[in-house]
């Protein structure tokens, strides 16, 4: 379990996981005061710093990535971990600290002059190479929506949803990410049963549109757990 993994790393007082993947209800939380956390972000507290459960890199801070805290650990038990500095081992870009990216399993400095070419090359090469995904790239570099003069249309390569035009989101398609339509009422959606499961999707769906949530289709209540169909429904 998440708690046992964290306890083994001397991290105390982890509450139940907060929030959830798209379509999941959030969890109730309460603020906890404490003393400032040195060396971290000015808002962190050291006496009750609690790791943040996550399902994907985008949910973490800019200097973090989402992974299991133990090597070879349960993929469903993931928290936000500190990014890796230059020359440290990596498996994907998001693991490397800002200003760096993952090349041949090592975090290397991003040379902004040829950086865009590197990314385009990575997108091309990454088909079939799970370690070269673009997840988390958006928060690391200058290649953000500002570099795209027009918002991406459906099918355009993207790094995050803000790169896409209104009504589209950035979702995984094979091992890169493209702009796909945000789901409308009645469309089939993906309800993730456990943390981290959408990291396994090759064809990721967008989230449900505004005012909709991903819920089990009423006439499928009797079906077995594995075959239940979820659709976007009004709140």
């Amino acid at each position: 379990t998440l708690n046992s993994v964290l306890n083994s790393n001397a991290i105390k007082n982890l509450p139940p996981p907060l929030g959830g993947a798209a379509g999941h209800p959030g969890s109730a939380v309460s603020a906890a005061p404490g003393i400032l956390y040195p060396g971290g972000n000015k808002y962190q507290t050291i006496d009750n710093y609690q790791p943040y459960p996550c399902a994907e890199d985008e949910e973490c801070g800019t200097d973090e990535y989402c992974a299991s805290p133990t090597r070879g650990g349960d993929a469903g038990v993931q928290i936000c971990l500190a990014c890796r500095k230059r020359r440290k081992r990596c498996m994907r870009h998001a693991m490397c600290c800002p200003g760096n990216y993952c090349k041949n399993g090592i975090c290397v400095s991003s040379d902004q002059n040829h950086f865009r070419g590197e990314i385009e090359e990575t997108i091309t090469e990454s088909f079939g190479n799970d370690h070269s995904t673009l997840d988390g790239y958006s928060r690391r570099t200058t290649l953000s929506s500002k570099m795209y003069h027009t918002k991406g249309q459906e099918g355009s390569v993207c790094l995050r949803s803000s790169d896409c035009a209104s009504g589209l989101c950035c979702a995984r398609h094979f091992w890169s990410k493209i702009c796909k339509p945000v789901l409308k009422e009645g469309q089939v959606c993906t309800k993730h049963r456990r943390k981290g499961s959408h990291g396994l999707e090759i064809f990721q769906r967008c989230y449900c549109g505004e005012g909709l949530s991903c819920r089990i289709q009423k006439d499928h209540h009797q079906a077995s757990n594995s075959s239940r169909l979820h659709t976007c429904q009004r709140h």
């Epitope: 982890l14 509450p15 907060l18 929030g19 959830g20 993947a21 798209a22 999941h24 209800p25 959030g26 939380v29 309460s30 603020a31 906890a32 404490g34 956390y37 971290g40 972000n41 808002y43 962190q44 507290t45 009750n48 710093y49 609690q50 790791p51 943040y52 459960p53 399902a55 994907e56 985008e58 949910e59 973490c60 801070g61 800019t62 200097d63 973090e64 936000c80 500190a82 928060r139 929506s145 995050r160 949803s161 803000s162 989101c169 989230y207």
Partner: nanobody, 129 residues
Framework: EVQLVESGGGSVQAGGSLRLSCTAS????????MAWFRQAPGKEREFVAA????????HYADSVKGRFTISRDNAKNTAFMQMSSLKPEDTAVYYC??????????????????????WGQGTQVTVSS
């Protein structure tokens, strides 16, 4: 100039519903968490609900869980809060706030008001019994 403008407040009977909107201008807010806080007369400002930059994470105070739903539309730089089954104790001024994505995140980040850089002027919600 960055501005957050709330709308949708008003008076309603207990059990009724309201939908608050918060529109941000002056910069893109897709890399910010958006949240609602509230302050009742004579009480401290308290956290109500937040939604992360990634759109996939929502957080709620115990007192509103199951009754309020927070959402956002990044393309329109707008956050929403659907409030249903309202109670007299929900009466307060509701403030929209925006917090930047931090370098390191903890479970307390979304609920701590000092993390929020931008605040709206507030919208009054009054629930009568």
């Amino acid at each position: 100039e960055v501005q957050l403008v709330e709308s949708g407040g008003g008076s309603v009977q207990a059990g009724g519903s309201l939908r608050l909107s918060c529109t941000a201008s002056g910069r893109p807010f897709d890399n910010y968490a958006m949240a609602w806080f509230r302050q009742a007369p004579g009480k401290e400002r308290e956290f109500v609900a937040a939604i992360s930059w990634s759109l996939s994470r929502t957080h709620y105070a115990d007192s509103v869980k199951g009754r309020f739903t927070i959402s956002r539309d990044n393309a329109k730089n707008t956050a929403f809060m659907q409030m249903s089954s309202l109670k007299p104790e929900d009466t307060a001024v509701y403030y929209c706030a925006a917090a930047p994505r931090p370098k390191r995140i903890s479970v307390q980040y979304f609920t701590t008001s000092s993390n929020y850089d931008y605040w709206g002027q507030g919208t009054q919600v009054t629930v009568s019994s």
